[in-house]
């Protein structure tokens, strides 16, 4: 039950994290106008991964995309690569985690599958999230570089009475969104790797018995396998003796080779 | 089509007040922003400030802000501009306007002339 | 505040030249997020208020001639009346929409030779 929890919360929370993730990459409010000397701006210019835009004090609102692909920074080139790279892997992360479900019976896929599936979903949301911090992180760092050059020359000067006002630019939405999704979408990949552990026993996973026989003791070591004493039947090495009591999760686990905790 | 209708002109004693207002027709009346830009004779314009009549959020001319108050009335369409402490450099010509793209003025209203005099 | 300086003060053409009007601005009118230069441009004939001719310093408004043309970027810009008609004859104010508070420039009289 609580493997199935684990799975199914892992799920979740990645799904909330992608969905947040894809959210942030098409959100416009990367970077906002610095407003600290100035609360209330007659434009407020706010730019995003793919465009640019203004809101006017009359209410309107105008934007321009960047169609340019060689003109733009490279910083801003490798942050929508990592963001892309980011959803691409979620997205394959969530497909996969979809037949790897405990609670989705699809044939007669065996619990190995699942494990292993599970597995896989649960690394590719790992670095789906991190993906998304570096990015975020990345864009954050390109903006308090910014930041502080321009605060350095907030006013470059032509000549006379003439000067022109660089527009500062401070954290948008999108990076704390961004930061939320990726650490939500690391947080369900963990998860979904611990939840892989317990869905099939390993067969080191036994409890020793011994059997007391009259005039030969057999031991059985865990595992389950008997001891080479040259006595019984057991030779193909079949498991004979659960020793542990078994979870609900458990119940129809074996003949399963590994063990994912 | 749009419209802005003002009051009529007004003749003030100083250190009175005045309400000028402003009818607005012919669109989304709460879409929009409200300007009051004033004109003293033979001069040019002064922006005094704006009103936007969903939320009667106001913008002030920090000039204006112990002069002029901006007040809206949703059910009739009309923003109001309250001048008070009057003084003979208040006489001048106020315009409303309606905000466009660009923070331009696109529509006006015809004016109104406010003398202060003793 | 941003100053608005128009010039000349006054403007005498003959009808069906070219007029040029032109207004310099303290600090750049230009929006980094949208690349629009918050400049507009009215027309005040005597007796009534403005009338929007150019917005975005370039954009003229619906039902204006295309005789008026605006151009310019960051702080400086010109409007060009191609071929003035008697009833151009008006004052013509540039106007700050780029930050609060808005501001007008001081205003340039054209009048027919």
């Known amino acids: 039950m609580a493997v199935t929890a684990c799975q199914g919360l892992g799920f979740v929370v990645s799904l909330i994290g992608i969905a947040g993730i894809i959210a942030a990459t098409c959100m416009d409010q990367w970077s906002t106008q610095d407003l600290y000397n100035n609360p209330v701006t007659a434009v407020f210019n706010y730019q995003g991964l793919w465009r640019s835009c203004v809101r006017e004090s009359s209410g309107f609102t105008e934007c321009r995309g960047y169609f340019t692909l060689l003109g733009l920074p490279a910083m801003l080139q490798a942050v929508r690569a990592l963001m892309i790279v980011g959803i691409v892997l979620g997205a394959i992360g969530l497909l996969v985690s979809i037949f790897a479900l405990k609670c989705i019976r699809i044939g007669s896929m065996e619990d190995s599958a699942k494990a292993n599936m599970t597995l896989t979903s649960g690394i590719m949301f790992i670095v789906s999230g991190l993906c998304a911090i570096a990015g975020v992180s990345v864009f954050a760092n390109m903006l308090v570089t910014n930041f502080w050059m321009s605060t350095a020359n907030m006013y470059t000067g032509m000549g006379g009475m003439v000067q022109t006002v660089q527009t500062r630019y401070t954290f948008g939405a999108a990076l704390f969104v961004g930061w939320v999704a990726g650490g939500l979408t690391l947080i369900g990949g963990v998860m979904m790797c611990i939840a892989c552990r317990g869905l099939a026993p390993e067969e080191t996973n036994y409890k020793a018995v011994s059997y007391h026989a009259s005039g030969h003791s057999v031991a059985y070591k865990p595992g389950g396998f008997k001891a080479s004493t040259g006595f019984g039947s057991n030779t193909k090495n079949k498991k004979i003796y659960d020793g542990g009591a078994r979870t609900e999760d458990e119940v129809q686990s074996y003949p399963s080779k590994h063990d994912y905790v | 089509q749009v419209q802005l209708v003002q009051s009529g002109a007004e003749v003030k004693k100083p250190g009175a007040s005045v309400k000028v207002s402003c009818k607005a027709s012919g669109y989304t009346f709460t879409n929009y922003w409200v300007n009051w830009v004033r004109q003293a004779p033979g001069q040019g314009l002064e922006w005094i400030g704006m009103?936007?009549?969903?939320?009667?959020?106001?913008r002030l001319n920090q000039q204006f802000k112990d002069k002029a108050t901006l007040t809206v009335d949703t059910s009739t369409s009309t923003v109001y501009m309250e001048l008070s402490s009057l003084r003979s450099e208040d006489t001048a010509v106020y315009y409303c306007?309606?905000?466009?793209?660009?923070?331009?003025?696109?529509?006006w209203g015809q004016g109104t002339l406010v003398t202060v005099s003793s | 505040d941003i100053v608005m300086t128009q010039s000349p003060d006054s403007l005498a053409v003959s009808l069906g030249e070219r007029a040029t009007i032109n207004c310099l601005s303290s600090?750049?009118?230009?929006?980094?997020?949208?690349?629009?230069?918050?400049l507009t441009w009215y027309q005040q004939k005597p007796g009534q208020p403005p009338k929007l001719l150019i917005y975005?310093?370039?954009t003229r408004d619906s039902g204006v001639p295309d005789r008026f043309t605006g151009s310019g970027s960051g702080v400086d810009f010109t409007l060009t009346i191609s071929s003035v008609q008697a009833e151009d004859v008006a004052v013509y104010y540039c106007?700050?929409?780029?930050?609060?508070?808005?501001?007008f420039g001081q205003g340039t009289k054209l009048e027919i030779k």
């Open positions: 009103v936007h009549p969903s939320g009667s959020e106001t």
């Open positions: 306007a309606r905000v466009w793209s660009g923070n331009a003025f696109d529509y």
């Open positions: 975005w310093a370039s």
């Open positions: 600090q750049s009118l230009l929006a980094s997020g949208n690349q629009r230069n918050y």
């Open positions: 106007q700050n929409g780029f930050s609060f508070p808005f501001t």
